[in-house]
């Protein structure tokens, strides 16, 4: 069976300078390879956090991602700025070289409001 | 510079326990997965156990199970290896090192040798 | 298991592919782990099927495909002399696997 990546909100608003947490589950770890979230599709997309790197000041992973069978790959955005307006994707990649996409979420917008 | 330094080893006799320790340094230990390694005399590498970068799961191949447990302290960036049953064949030099994102390995320790003899 | 050659030879300046059968594409990653005598620690040259660390030289790769994994040395050096061990992740099991080691010299 396909590896599926949930999304449960379609969206969700904070308020500037604020948390935001951003949830995906995957029903599947397999086939192996990497989780990522982006924001917005196509060749524009930005990447907003790997789970393959730490290098990503204001994202951290909500749950342990180290745990071998963590299915949750949740994200916390710190100290929102409006600029981190837009759609959120959990994207799940087969290993490869370069990895392939195969399964996306969803998306969850994030609306940003004035403090 | 990642820094991974085992310590504890040392002879004891067959039944006895054992606890080996792996002290932590040059990254942030509370981030990584990590895993316990051994190689016996005249062999190859056997991996033995992982454990989740907050301490919550552990894995175990089987020949190790019930026997050995894998544990850490993040606050004392130091991860743990309590043998316990140990038998001859048990004798090997042990090595901690750390997980990537993938649970293979990327830095290792210099090792600690435990010797189980009568 | 993971099965890998129990050695082989080459020249200096010649290209070596060392490779290793028995994991599955669809649940294992690959790694590959030099180590220069026994009992010395270590040392990881490709993890996660093909990434090099900073500081393992250019002529060590690695690529997996199928069911195999291989690591390439191209242009290999005297210095390149030890046992290389390949290990597998399975995603399916969380267990690691190492293969049993291969010897390689250059003569």
């Known amino acids: 069976t396909e590896v599926k990546v949930i999304q449960p909100e379609k969206s969700v608003s904070v308020a500037a300078g604020d948390s935001t947490v951003l949830n995906c589950t995957l029903t599947s770890l397999l086939p192996v390879g990497p989780i990522r979230w982006y924001r917005g599709v196509g060749q524009s997309r930005q990447l907003i956090y790997s789970f393959t790197t730490e290098h990503f000041p204001r994202v951290t992973n909500v749950s342990d991602a180290t745990k071998r069978s963590n299915l949750d790959f949740s994200i916390r955005i710190s100290n929102v700025t409006p600029e981190d307006a837009g759609t959120y994707y959990c994207v799940k990649f087969q290993r490869g070289s370069p990895d392939t996409e195969i399964q996306s979420g969803g998306g969850t917008e994030v609306y940003v409001l004035a403090k | 510079d990642v820094q991974l330094v085992e310590s504890g080893g040392g002879v004891v006799r067959p039944g006895e326990s054992l606890r080996l320790s792996c002290a932590a340094s040059?990254?942030?230990?509370?981030?990584?997965?990590m895993s316990w390694v051994r190689q016996a005399p005249g062999k190859g590498l056997e991996w033995l156990a992982g454990?989740?970068?907050?301490?919550?799961?552990?894995y175990y191949i089987d020949s190790v199970k019930g026997r050995f447990t894998i544990s850490r302290d993040n606050s004392k960036n130091s991860l743990y290896l309590q043998m316990n049953s140990l038998t001859a064949e048990d004798t090997a030099v042990y090595y901690c090192?750390?997980?990537?994102?993938?649970?293979?390995?990327?830095?290792w320790g210099l090792g600690t040798l435990v010797t189980v003899s009568s | 298991a993971l099965t890998q050659p129990a050695s082989v030879s080459a020249n200096p300046g010649e290209t070596v592919k060392i490779t290793c059968s028995g994991g599955d594409w669809y649940s294992t990653y690959y790694g590959w782990y030099q180590q220069k005598s026994p009992g010395s620690a270590p040392v990881t040259v490709i993890h996660s099927d093909d990434k090099r660390p900073s500081d393992i030289p250019s002529r060590f790769s690695g690529s997996a495909s199928g069911s195999a994994a291989t690591l390439t040395i191209t242009g290999v050096r005297v210095e390149d002399e030890a046992v290389y061990y390949c290990a597998g992740y399975d995603g399916r099991t969380y267990i690691n696997t190492f293969g049993a080691g291969t010897t390689l010299t250059v003569l």
């Open positions: 040059g990254f942030t230990f509370s981030s990584y997965a």
């Open positions: 454990i989740s970068a907050g301490g919550s799961d552990a």
């Open positions: 090192a750390r997980e990537t994102w993938n649970h293979l390995f990327d830095y």
